[in-house]
Amino acid sequence: LSEEADDTDSELGSMKPLHTFCAMKADDGPCKAMIRSYFFNMYTHQCEEFIYGGCEGNENRFDTLEECKKTCIPGYEKTAVKAASGAERPDFCFLEEDPGLCRGYMKRYLYNNQTKQCERFVYGGCLGNRNNFETLDECKKICENPVHSPSPVNEVQMSDYVTDGNTVTDRSTVNNIVVPQSPKVPRRRDYRGRPWCLQPADSGLCKASERRFYYNSATGKCHRFNYTGCGGNNNNFTTRRRCLRSCKTGLIKNKSKGVVK
């Protein structure tokens, strides 16, 4: 059996965060948008993902993982530079591929110590280990040594992907399951709200059947759809009320009527 090394230790640097706000708890705020953000977790000493509601909250919130790490992890940039120069890689770069306990289909990247390259793998959506990166670039920056592989032969071409909201969806099949692609939706002239409210309902890539709501920009209403439990896009709300609050305010019916609340 493949036993994973412990990966619960502090990722980089000392235990003391660089700024006081890095010690604040993740605060999703009172609004109900679903914006992927990152915060520094004082318990794990890592930057982690959370869903931001779109308003209020606190300063421990970053748009990118990189920004969070730079801001809150002491010595992060120095360590990242060391890794890139081949001097030293974090231990987790040497962990074996672990798809995790769950069986969603999420495109991720890991460092392969045999080939000395970052490669694509399918992550199940929960647990696993820290040799798991959202982008090829992030994987390369932290784990790959450019001296060994200036231009890897089997480097994944980003043109093989369709980027939709927060998910990167392969055109091909994953584990014999055809992965859906969300059609590109033109931005409507009469809609001035959040861009993900224009995306079509996307049931995702798993096998559950969960009741969710999406905003239909043509009708200006929120409709029910079945969500399979992972993947999909941000036009996905747990209640009709949240859906309307998040998306309906952007609908401009015409100049005389103004904005529909």
């Epitope: 059996l1 619960t8 679903m34 982690e48 929960c126 995702g204 559950a208």
Partner: antibody, heavy 123, light 112 residues
């Protein structure tokens, strides 16, 4: 309908090895849509997850740090079962031990449990 | 380790009345698209635990619709809209954001 049937001794002497088996019916230990776990329950510690195994492209295991140096969970594909071995037991290991299936596809949770085995560590 | 703190630890209920159990996590359990890495289980007297709610708010098969799960970030709630006599037992929340998988200490629901 998945069923998990536990077997093993209820009394183990201190410093010896606790061994339990969980026989699976209605699913396969090698299924790529499940994972197989041991969890124990004692009055002092509540429900405590001990470890898990799962097969994807190969077998994986993860163990709780509290027992990592003493625990082994192994699959037995020929008998469609999995086992728990906990070495060097002390009275602290006295608990009801459960095997459980983690549903990897739909529920993402422990949706089937064995009947539980009370293991007492005493001389 | 992620610590889950349940409250109350004991909850006397009247049949037909609503009940609510809280589970607070030491760190966020929400992933993208509103997936919450939190489950709820019920352990009836003398039985093994059974899955009630998965991914924060989804009822497992065969679970009556009087049970509902909600919450986000670090604060989660299990609600029973109208308690029935068969609902007595100990309720546990459980997280799977990171290893080790951890459970709350349990809330014992009993009839008044």
């Amino acid at each position: 309908q998945v069923q998990l049937q536990q077997s093993g001794p209820g009394l183990v002497k201190p410093s010896q090895t606790l061994s339990l088996t969980c026989a699976i019916s209605g699913d396969s230990v090698s299924s790529d849509s499940a994972a197989w776990s041991w969890i124990r329950q004692s009055p002092g510690r509540g429900l405590e997850w001990l470890g898990i195994i799962y097969k994807r492209s190969k077998w994986y295991n993860r163990y709780a740090v509290s027992v990592k140096s003493r625990i082994t969970i192994n699959p037995d594909t020929s008998k469609n079962q999995f086992s728990l071995q906990l070495n060097s037991v002390t009275p602290e290991d006295t608990a009801v031990y459960y095997c459980a299936r983690w549903h990897s596809d739909k529920h993402w949770g422990f949706d089937d449990w064995g009947q539980g085995t009370l293991v007492t560590v005493s001389s | 380790d992620i610590v889950l703190t349940q409250s109350p630890l004991s909850l006397p209920v009247t049949p037909g009345e609503p009940a609510s159990i809280s589970c607070r996590s030491s760190q966020s359990l929400v992933f993208r698209f509103g997936i919450t890495y939190l489950n709820w289980y019920l352990q009836k007297p003398g039985q093994s635990p059974q899955l009630l709610i998965y991914k924060g708010s989804n009822r497992a098969s065969g679970v009556p619709d009087r049970f509902s799960g909600s919450g986000s970030g670090t604060d989660f709630t299990l609600k029973i809209s109208r308690v029935e006599a068969e609902d007595v037992g100990v309720y546990y929340c459980q997280q799977y954001t990171s290893y080790p998988l951890t459970f709350g200490q349990g809330t014992k629901v009993e009839i008044k």
